[in-house]
Amino acid sequence: TQNKALPENVKYGIVLDAGSSHTSLYIYKWPAEKENDTGVVHQVEECRVKGPGISKFVQKVNEIGIYLTDCMERAREVIPRSQHQETPVYLGATAGMRLLRMESEELADRVLDVVERSLSNYPFDFQGARIITGQEEGAYGWITINYLLGKFSQKTRWFSIVPYETNNQETFGALDLGGASTQVTFVPQNQTIESPDNALQFRLYGKDYNVYTHSFLCYGKDQALWQKLAKDIQVASNEILRDPCFHPGYKKVVNVSDLYKTPCTKRFEMTLPFQQFEIQGIGNYQQCHQSILELFNTSYCPYSQCAFNGIFLPPLQGDFGAFSAFYFVMKFLNLTSEKVSQEKVTEMMKKFCAQPWEEIKTSYAGVKEKYLSEYCFSGTYILSLLLQGYHFTADSWEHIHFIGKIQGSDAGWTLGYMLNLTNMIPAEQPLSTPLSHSTYV
């Protein structure tokens, strides 16, 4: 008799990353009998929800259900029907919603209420929506990349699964850049973490980790740009802002009300004699870099050393994975190669920012102008943040690896979040058995 293929004994999980600029849905899959093994969970699908982040729906809450439909229907298609009821769904909202909550807890709750009601109509095991803390965002990003890199596995491999993997059990640090916040997370070398708020203790797979993390709210690339504009318009002599972070020939009208809408610009707010102003690009990397540095207060530090704004930062240690917008921006600028030195990156940025806007539009005809116009700022901001903010140097630059995916799974906080909520990261090393029960048929 012919052997009949046994049904795949797999499980699925869904995480929605409700970021400040957009929402993405991730579907993960793993063998049911290997839940406690490291490296078995992998991403099978990413669905980017069309539209802005959920915090932008404050005035149109009734549209949230429709907004989520396409990606939730996609999940319904990808996951076998027999598994729907057992598949957990988690939604984590990040800095966009943290900012909305700062403005109004009631409005943030209203958005989350409608999100939860909408998601509960699907046949999955919906586990709620919540605003995760910056500390969680940093920690789960760190867990994700180290899980995918196999850093928690006790078995040392003689082969490398990714090009930049150093074949040891030293964990990678995590650098995450979003639209509204940025996170830095790593294990410092024998250094006490001087501020308790930045210290995390984990026991994973039988090993203890003392982890440093900090999330800089308002220092994601979009909010940093708003900050920079609010700072620079203070000293503008009229309603024209000549901006070195935009290409020569670029022009854009900005409403002052939009500029001051976010809590991130409150410190720069002032009464202006106009309701609108026009950005006129002049495309000068060096001046742009200087303007960005003014967002980082480095004059005050109550610790042995700081990043900026009086936030403790231990000496950098080991390799770092830089993902999310760190990766997307550098990938667009073609600067993710391991071989490109920091000096070369700076040189390329100088050239890129100096290119006329008309030329840029022609070269990148397929890219939306809104995004295209901001790559000069974003690239410059990344360099400023990493070099002056986090104190990377030309030498330590080679320890930064710009990562989009690791073994097919996106680098980011969502996988770590799901692993934690489904209890798939044991504190102790699971006992390895020669054959699992499912091996016997």
Epitope: V61, I64, D113, V114, E116, S120
Partner: antibody
Amino acid sequence: QVQLVQSGAEVKKPGSSVKVSCKASGGTFSTYAIGWVRQAPGQGLEWMGGIIPAFGTANYAQKFQGRVTITADESTSTAYMELSSLRSEDTAVYYCARDPVRRSPFDIWGQGTMVTVSS
Amino acid sequence: EIVLTQSPATLSLSPGERATLSCRASQSVSSYLAWYQQKPGQAPRLLIYDSSNRATGIPARFSGSGSGTDFTLTISSLEPEDFAVYYCQQSFLWPRTFGGGTKVEIK
């Protein structure tokens, strides 16, 4: 003080539909949610679904999905619950109740509407 | 969905006695648990919300405690009007679910 007043008792045949109304008075109808809960004779309470009238956002218990429709009319401050393909097991008292904010319980209840399904 | 298990199903006590009702959730509901009282032919009435907060107009003899998965409703000294059915309900996750109820009857 907010009050919820429901429509009167109904007797229905199996396979038919019933539509129960719930009129709010003395408060801002649109800013909170209305939930529907039923109770079969001698049994416990069972949540069926709810709606936020201001946004038209309704959600339903999986058990009733496809058979229940919850709507609201802001102009008359009235919420409706329609249950189709009735069977004898649907004989119950149907309550509407207010749930004022996210993750809050039902703080104000209607008086209940008895629906009897019998051939 | 979250299953709420109430115990005991029936509690036979005399007026003036202390009543302790239990509600256990199949998974954590944080502190989003409410207690209702229902008398025959009447709609339920909210007694306690967010595990331990008394609703408007509820006498001080009613108190709630617990968080996560284990919750308790205590009636410090039973009054004749307290003999009724009591339900717990979670509002942490959808679908909203109720416990099966505890009937507090006169001994």
